[in-house]
Structure formats: C-alpha cells, structure tokens
Interface confidence: low
C-alpha cells in the first residue's frame, strides 16, 4: 500500500515536499535514510510513526506548522545526523512542555531558524548534542545570550544567529564552545564589541548591527585566528584597532561613518588617541604579536560608503598583501600612491564616486593593478602619464570626470591632457561624459583596447585616425549621444568589432561593409538615417544579430535590405511592429507593412526588393 503515499522514493531517499500532509506518513520503507517533509502542514511530531524509521540520517521538517514535539520524539532515531526544524512554530509553549528536543547524540547539524524563539526559552529547547558541528538559530527573536545558552555542545564549529534582536552577549557566552570557528551575528542590535576574545574563531560576521566600537581583548600573548571579519552597515566612527588580528584576510567596513585621521597622532605612545581617530589605525602591533605587522596578510578591504576625506601614507604602508581595495562613495579629494612598492599586490582599486580632483600614482607603485575605477569624480588636469605608469592596468573607468585625452606620440595634446597611447596592457576604457571636445589622431596608438566607450560627450569631434591602432583589437565601441553628423572612422577596418553603439547622434550615412565582418549588435537609434542600402549593409548579414533603428526618419522605399531583414528575420530588428517609415508624401506607416507595389507608384520603384 505504499502507492497510496504520494512521496517520491529513490534508493533510501524519500521526498514528501509540499504535499499538504498533516502528519508523518506511516507507510514509508523502514530503511529510509533521508526523509524530506518540508513545506507541509505538520503540527505535531509524535514518537510514532517517526520512531519506525530508525535508519534515518537526514530529516527535514522545515516550513511546517510544528508547535508540539512529543517528549522523546527523536529518541529512537539513533543514527540521525542532520535535523531541520526551520520555519515552524516551536516558540509556542506546547513545543517545550517536557524536555524540548531531548538528547541528539549523533546529530551534526541542526537548523532551528525562523521559529520566533526568544531568550530563556531556547535553553529549554536545546538538549545534549555532543556531536553538533553546525547550529542555525537565525531569524528568531533572541535578545541576549548567556553562559547557559550553549551548554552541552562541545563540538560546535559553526553558529548562525543572524536576524535576531541580540542586544547583549554575556561574558563567557561562547566559553563552552572551544571549537567554534564560524560565527554569524549579522542583522542584530549589537552596539559595541568591547572585549573580543574568541581566539579560535576564523569567520565573524557582525554586519548590519549598530556597532560603534570594536575592540579586541587586551591579552598580550593572544594568538587570534580570525581571517574574515564583516562589519559593514554599522556605526563605526573610526577604523577599528585590529593590531591583535594578524591573520585577517578579508575585512569589510563599508557603510559606516569612518573618517581617517588627517594629522599625526596626539599620543606618541602608539595607537590610542581616540580624539583624533588614531585608535582607528593599525599603525603598530602589540608587543606579543609574532608578525609585528598588523593587516600585512589582508587581501580584501572594503571601506566604501564612509566619510573618509584623506588616506594617510602610513595607512597604506602595511597593506603589502592587499589585492582588492574599495574606497568608493567617500569624500576623497586626492589620492596618492607614489612610494616605490606601495600596494604591490593590489589588483583592483575602486575610487569611484568621491570628489577626487588630483591623483598621483608613482612610476613604480601599484605594479599589479589591473582594474582602476574612477567614475563619478572631478578629475581634470592630471599628469600626462598617470595611467601609462601602471604596468598591469587592464580596465579603466573614468566616466563622469573632465579628462582630456592627448593625441598620439607625434600629435601632442594641450597641457593637462592625459596619455592613453602606449598602455599595452589596457583592454577596457570608459571616457563617458568627460566633456571631451576633440579626440586627436593616435589617441590610442599601441593600446590594444577591446572595449572603448566615448558616449555622452556632446559636440565631440573625432579626428581622422583618432581610433588608429585599434583595428585589430576593438570588440565594443560606444559613441552614443555625441551629436556626431559624420563618422571619421573607417568602421569596416575594425575586423573584431562585435558591438557598435552609435545611438543619439545625427548620422545619416554608414560606411559600406562590403566584406564579412564580426559585428553582432548595431545600435543606430535616434539618428538621421533614411536609407540603409544593401550595398552598404551586405557584409553584415552573416554576423549581425540585432539592429536598433527606432527614432530614424526611415524611407519606406529604397530600404529593401531592411525590409528583407524584417520578413526573413536573419537580423533581429527591434520593435518591428512600430518601425515607422515615411513615403515622400510624409505619410507614415509601419515598414513591415510596405509592399513592393507601394513603391512603384509614381516611379518609386524599390530596386532593392
């Protein structure tokens, strides 16, 4: 009579997900090892029939309406290793009437998230769990943790407490968890970490609290193992004192209120002068710290969305392993990395959306930098070789600045221009919205760009040969919104070009693509095209996938190539229903509705169709 149970059974795994069940089925194979009953309407868990399935190792009871656990309900499940009771109603009194979950001798992972559990009640629910490695209490209503909260679980390694309302963690709350390595306390209501002393902890997530200060315990010989610390979305006013955490690899401090000090520390003894924010800086290590160089192993530092106005030299000095530094959305007016060997491993530097006016990058600094994001600043008169000095630079975003590109080596630009030629590593460059008036010949010579965006520079004049040297490398070119009437670019020579954006100009002619090229997407929206003759477009037929044409004064006749694309569909032309064309009488119709005979009236024979 097993066929009466609508569960799916494969080997020793049984899935009864979302079947509207009101109770645990009693007719499943007794040797079932994995049982998924999630998403049903179970209200109580009784020792019978659950106790029949003594071979169970995995039991998922999540997303039900469980408010009653019969004492000893799990007692017979002596092999049980993974138990999920997430998203039920265990906070209701009947769930805890006698002994809660009871002992769980072999359970290694237990999920009690989303049960509205509150402090005090939790202690009654948790029983002895000597093998427990992973415990989730996320999305509950816990307000405090005491010494008694986590007793009898000596093997616990991972503890998830995110999305509670924790305001208070009693001293010694985690003392009974000697193996704890991962602790998630994000999305709580903590205001201060004044005595962090969990030496064995490796990962600590404190994001989305209201923390104003983070201080490690003052144990001179302490060897903290912490490698990953997330403090984003808090209320830190200063860079925390992390000198006791020499193994930190990942540090996220974004979305705080951090300012870095602008002068030397008032207190010459070291790192404790809170008035100036120097408690904030990892300038010297405590005497007992073996490495002697705090943050020397840090790979990833996120300081975005803070209130930093200046980066002191001493701050960058110790970050010798740093690969990723995010300083976007701060108040920086200047950034300097001039010293030989400054940030030697840095691969990505995000300085976007600050108020940068000056940028000084030394000839041998930032030797590993691949990505530099500078969009949304006020950069204007930069030293000409600012970017040419960056030996590994591959991607550069300068959108929304006021940078003027120099010409090629034989075509020097005006004072204050920046050289973009001869940067042999550079692949992607955005100069969108820089008020560039003239793009000089040879501007990108010996810089094998694959992507170049010059959009939103109204009035831009592209000199003959301005894109010279890019013919064999360029794959994406955008010249949108520049008011161009003619294009001084021999497009068919760009043999690798896949995407071309010429929208929002005043173009009426394109060069003839007579031989097959690589172009896949062509955006000609809002220009002045009336004809796209087959003689010019023929070479695109094999490669072109999408063509954007709305907002052009297209002629209904003489556009046979375009009509053929609409009907045969080799090229996906946008909005085919609404692509409007005009007859000489100024009558407007949908181009897809034009018939050959419409163009023969009055001698308007459509020779291309």
């Amino acid at each position: 009579h097993q066929d009466k149970v609508p569960c799916k059974m494969v080997d020793k795994k049984v899935s009864c997900q979302v079947l509207g069940l009101l109770q645990v089925p009693s007719v499943l194979p007794p040797d079932t090892e994995t049982l998924d009953l999630s998403g049903n309407q179970l209200r109580s868990i009784l020792a019978s029939p659950l106790g029949f399935y003594t071979a169970l190792r995995h039991l998922d009871l999540s997303t039900n309406e469980i408010s009653f656990l019969q004492p000893g309900a799990f007692q017979a499940l002596t092999h049980l290793e993974h138990l999920s009771l997430a998203h039920n109603r265990l906070a209701m009194a009947t769930a805890l009437s006698a002994g809660g979950l009871g002992p769980l001798p072999r359970v290694t992972s237990l999920d009690l998230s989303g049960n509205s559990l509150y402090s005090g009640l939790l202690e009654r629910l948790l029983g002895e769990a000597p093998s427990l490695h992973t415990l989730s209490l996320a999305e509950n209503s816990l307000t405090r943790l005491t010494r008694h909260t986590f007793r009898d679980m000596p093997a616990l390694e991972q503890l998830d407490l995110h999305s509670n309302v924790l305001m208070d963690i009693e001293d010694g709350a985690f003392e009974g968890l000697p193996r704890l390595t991962h602790l998630n306390l994000s999305r709580n209501s903590l205001t201060c970490i004044s005595d962090f002393s969990l030496q064995q902890l490796r990962v600590l997530d404190l994001s989305c609290n209201s923390i104003e200060a983070f201080q490690t315990a003052s144990q001179p010989q302490a060897e903290f193992q912490l490698t990953w610390l997330d403090l984003r979305e808090n209320k830190l006013l200063h860079f925390p004192d992390l000198a006791a955490l020499p193994r930190l690899i990942y540090l996220n401090l974004s979305n705080n209120l951090i300012r870095l000090p602008t002068g030397p520390p008032q207190d010459s003894k070291g790192i404790h002068a809170p008035s100036e924010g120097w408690s904030a800086l990892p300038l010297s290590a405590p005497s007992g710290n073996a490495s002697g160089r705090p943050l020397s192993q840090l790979l990833n530092l996120d300081l975005s969305y803070n209130e930093i106005e200046l980066i002191p030299d001493s701050f960058l000095e110790h970050l010798t392993s740093l690969c990723f530094l995010n300083l976007s959305r701060n108040c920086l007016r200047t950034f300097e990395a001039r010293r030989l060997g400054s940030l030697p491993c840095l691969m990505l530097l995000d300085l976007s959306h600050n108020a940068l006016e000056t940028l000084e990058l030394g000839a041998r600094a930032l030797g590993s930098l691949r990505t530099l994001l500078l969009q949304g600043n006020a950069l204007r008169d930069l030293p000409p070789y600012t970017f040419a000095n960056l030996a590994s630079l591959q991607r550069l975003n300068l959108q929304g600045n006021r940078v003027s590109p120099c010409g090629g080596p034989d075509e020097p630009g005006p004072s204050g221009c920046v050289a973009f030629s001869g940067i042999t590593s550079l692949r992607s460059l955005s100069l969108v919205d820089n008020e560039i008036e003239l793009l000089r010949a040879g501007a990108f010579l010996h810089t094998p760009l694959t992507e170049l965006d010059l959009s939103s520079n109204p009035g831009l004049e592209v000199a003959t040969g301005a894109l010279g040297g890019l013919e064999a490398s360029l794959e994406v070119l955008a010249l949108q919104g520049n008011g161009l009437m003619v294009l001084q670019v021999d497009l068919p020579c760009f043999i690798c070009l896949k995407r071309l954006n010429l929208a929002e100009n005043r173009l009426s002619h394109l060069p003839a693509w007579t031989q097959a090229v690589s172009l896949e997407v062509l955006d000609l929206r809002n220009n002045s095209f009336s004809l796209l003759p087959g003689s010019a477009m023929g070479g695109l037929e094999t490669s072109l996938r999408r063509l954007y044409l709305q907002g052009n004064p297209l002629s209904c006749c003489g556009n046979g190539w375009l009509a053929a694309q609409l009907h045969q569909g080799r090229v996906d032309v946008d909005a085919t229903q609404d692509l409007i064309c005009r007859f000489s009488s100024q009558e407007e119709v949908s181009l897809s509705h034009v018939r050959p005979e419409d163009c023969e009236k009055g001698g308007l024979k459509n020779i291309n169709l």
């Epitope: 919104g481 929208a503 100009n505 929206r525 809002n526 907002g551 909005a575």
Partner: antibody, heavy 120, light 107 residues
Framework: QVQLRESGPGLVQPSQTLSLTCTVS????????VSWVRQPPEKGLEWIAT???????YYNSALKSRLSISRDTSKSQVFLKMSTLQTEDTAMYFC??????????????WGQGASVTVSS | DIQMTQSPASLSGSLGETVTIQCQAS??????LAWYQQKPGKSPQLLIY???SLQDGVPSRFSGGGSGTHYSLKISSMQTEDEGVYFC?????????FGSGTKLEIK
C-alpha cells in the same frame, strides 16, 4: 544631486488639454532621456512618452494621437501635453530619468509626481 | 508590444522570511528587466536593472535573476520597510511596459 520635479494644474475639465512640466537638476537633458509615466488611483504604472537625450520622441501608441512631448534644454525642462482629457486620465503623473547606455531603458530617478484630476 | 505578466498580485510574508515575485515577458527581452519598489504615496524606486544588477544604495537582501522570458525578484530576510508594491518593467524596447504589480505585506 539628481532631482526631477513635476508641476501642473491639478484639476482639469473634461475635453480640455493637460500641460505638465518636469524641471530637472543635477544632470543635463542632452545626456539622458526623460520619460513620463502615470498611475491611476490604486492601479499600476503606465508609460506615456519619452524624449531622448538627442531630442527623439517615443509615445505610447494607445495615447499617441493626444500626446506631445518636448523640452527646453536651456531651462532643463521637459513638457508633456495631453489633449481631450477624460475622467480615466485621472492619475498621478511622474517624470523619470532613463539611465545608462546600451540596450536597456531603465528609470533610475523619479520625481515626486503631480496629481491630476479630470472632473467638471 | 511586449506584455509583462507579474505574479502573484499580492503576497504576505513574515519578518525574516524569503519571498519571491515572478515576472514573465511575452517574448525574449535579453535580460532587459528592471524591478521597482513603491511605497504608499511615494514615487517608485529602482531596485534592480539588467535583470540582476543591484542599484546603488539598495540593500543586498534584494536580488534579481532570470533570462529569456522568465525573471524573478527575491527578498531574503524580509524587513518591515520592504512593505509596498513591486513592479517589473521591460526596458529592451519602446513602448516600455510594466507588470501589473505585486503588493507585499507583512504578516
């Protein structure tokens, strides 16, 4: 910072013409498209029209015969005229900036809306 | 015109819960989908563009996904301030079209 502000009459007689103005600051109309979108009481959003950064115009085909969108770049203003108003044109009218380059039209900043009631 | 079908029309979720809203386009929109949130008496706010890119300043509990004609908005660990109406919009081509909206309430 980027802002858009709609202004208009509030109350319009049936069969009359509605004139709305969207005044923008923090960006240039020659760099970004601007759209008009409306929302009748307790209903969803309906796109009305867009004027592109190059001055091109796009209209909702169901309303096109009654619409006109224009702009004055020197005053940073976009105008919408809608003729022959009926009671079903009662709605909150928003103007919004369209962001980004590429092939997607996304409204990243919206005005607070102008309430328009069509009633005699 | 591209039709956008949004579901469900209304949805209630508990604090901390994960909720998902679906949006289906009548044709392939090549990830040209945006999601907006609107609170009573306020204008819509952009949450997600390009199907999965988070707009600056939007909390990371919001995420978007999908391709072709099927897209979704997921809110993990729902907060009180997430109550409101959510709209999808295709931004591939004119006429721009919106989904009918999903009203999200706290249980």
């Amino acid at each position: 910072q980027v802002q858009l502000r709609e202004s208009g009459p509030g109350l319009v007689q049936p069969s009359q013409t509605l004139s709305l103005t969207c005044t923008v600051s923090g960006f240039s109309l020659t760099s970004f498209h601007v759209s008009w979108v409306r929302q009748p009481p307790e209903k969803g959003l309906e796109w009305i029209a867009t004027i592109s950064s190059g001055g091109g115009t796009y209209y909702n085909s169901a309303l096109k015969s009654r619409l006109s969108i224009s702009r004055d770049t020197s005053k940073s203003q976009v105008f919408l005229k809608m003729s022959t108003l009926q009671t079903e044109d009662t709605a909150m009218y928003f103007c919004a900036r369209i962001s980004g380059w590429g092939h997607y039209y996304v409204m990243d900043v919206w005005g607070q809306g102008a309430s328009v009631t069509v009633s005699s | 015109d591209i039709q956008m079908t949004q579901s469900p029309a209304s949805l209630s979720g508990s604090l901390g819960e994960t909720v998902t809203i679906q949006c289906q386009a009548s044709e392939d929109i090549y990830s040209g989908l945006a999601w907006y949130q609107q609170k009573p008496g306020k204008s819509p706010q952009l949450l997600i563009y390009g199907a999965g890119s988070l707009q600056d300043g939007v909390p990371s509990r919001f995420s978007g996904g999908g391709s072709g004609t099927h897209y979704s908005l997921k809110i993990s660990s729902m907060q009180t301030e997430d109550e409101g109406v959510y709209f999808c919009q295709q931004g591939l081509k004119f006429p721009l079209t919106f989904g009918s909206g999903t009203k999200l309430e706290i249980k």
